[in-house]
Amino acid sequence: SGTTNTVAAYNLTWKSTNFKTILEWEPKPVNQVYTVQISTKSGDWKSKCFYTTDTECDLTDEIVKDVKQTYLARVFSYPAGNVESTGSAGEPLYENSPEFTPYLETNLGQPTIQSFEQVGTKVNVTVEDERTLVRRNNTFLSLRDVFGKDLIYTLYYWKSSSSGKKTAKTNTNEFLIDVDKGENYCFSVQAVIPSRTVNRKSTDSPVECMGQEKGEFREI
């Protein structure tokens, strides 16, 4: 229950990629506004997005403080223009989010192939180490900094003339693969966290092919 013109938020959903984390909910407000609170299981509630008419709230700044913690958020509904008004129980109407553990649940963003270099029959493929919004000592950490060896990359590579995708994997950001001399290859990478059971994989990187600008060929 609540005031007659206030409805509780519903469908609270965490949207998170590389730790950029937004809480979304419904409904679009009619004569009401929202405030969001976030807390760890053992911590105090912190208010964010005060009296907003949006149906999303960026909680990145809070969750990056400790990405291995489990967070809970709640969305309060207030009548527009009368934010002191409360529900019949003497407090504003609110709805809880599902629990969210960033380290286990944030989606892996689409990786990018930074470069590839061929030396004879070997190709070195380097994946860009994407920066996250997680900070340590006033420095933004990369995805590799945060996940360490929990993060692997899968490389798909194939001859331009073929459809079958060979694979390699690395727990760094570099691959060294054998190729056939005189053949052009294409590459795509995917970030994977094997220890997860869901949200294990990123989407694939854009495909890069030999003979394009990113690559370098050196004949030995």
């Epitope: 692997i152 899968t154 798909y156 459809s163 079958g164 995708k165 060979k166 694979t167 390699a168 994997k169 693969i177 054998d178 995917q190 994977v192 094997p194 997860r196 059971t197 869901v198 949200n199 294990r200 994989k201 989407t203 694939d204």
Partner: antibody, heavy 120, light 107 residues
């Protein structure tokens, strides 16, 4: 509980076709990679091919390339192995297996297998 | 393709024996080797992954090690339920390839 269940095997004449299914439960195949491995009677294990259901990428062993096709239906959480132009040497138990890592071929869960017999 | 040469092809041992099975890769495969156990009429079971890591639920009497391109599966004290066929497998590059198998029989 993670489970893989194969079906669709049977007796088929040389040159014939079959479609083998691998129904997964306890996990979503989109998040993993599914491989097919076969074992001829009394012989060792032979890798057949893989599919990454998140992007449809596949790769096949030379011995089956052009004859076998792996596909996946993520809405049914099922992978398939279409086997065409069958030969006597394709007689084997066919297993599907889940990759523990990405697409490397380290298999933590296997199905019980389905027997394909190619004989006239 | 990378060849995995497994030896011996069979061995006879008694309960309590220490058993060693080896696999040699035809080229460098880093630590990308797994070991499986298979019993008649059953699917293989993962024992060791990444050359030396014991898979969840596998008894600690099983261990794996690497020396260059040589890989070893050791059963420190053979138990009655360990009589089976064991396969090594490289997953360093596509296609993954298996060793020929080692059948461990009761002496």
């Amino acid at each position: 509980e993670v489970q893989l269940v194969e079906s669709g095997g049977g007796l088929v004449q040389p040159g014939g076709s079959l479609r083998l299914s691998c129904a997964a439960s306890g996990f979503t195949i989109f998040d993993y990679t599914i491989h097919w491995v076969r074992q001829a009677p009394g012989k060792g294990l032979e890798w057949v091919g893989y599919i990454d259901p998140s992007n449809g990428y596949t790769f096949y062993a030379d011995s089956v390339k052009g004859r076998f096709t792996i596909s996946a239906d993520t809405s049914k959480n099922t992978a398939y192995l279409q086997v065409n132009s069958l030969r006597a040497e394709d007689t084997a138990v066919y297993y599907c297996a889940r990759d523990i890592q990405s697409v490397s071929g380290e298999f933590d869960y296997w199905g019980q297998g389905t027997l394909v017999t190619v004989s006239s | 393709d990378i060849q995995m040469t497994q030896s011996p092809s069979s061995l006879s041992a008694s309960v309590g024996d220490r058993v060693t099975i080896t696999c040699r890769a035809s080229q460098d495969v880093n630590t990308a080797v797994a070991w499986y156990q298979q019993k008649p009429g059953k699917a293989p079971k993962l024992l060791i992954y990444s050359a030396s890591f014991l898979y969840s639920g596998v008894p600690s009497r099983f261990s794996g090690s690497r020396s260059g391109t040589d890989f070893t599966l050791t059963i420190s004290s053979l138990q009655p339920e360990d009589f089976a066929t064991y396969y090594c497998q490289q997953h360093y590059t596509t296609p993954p390839t298996f060793g020929q198998g080692t059948k461990v029989e009761i002496k």
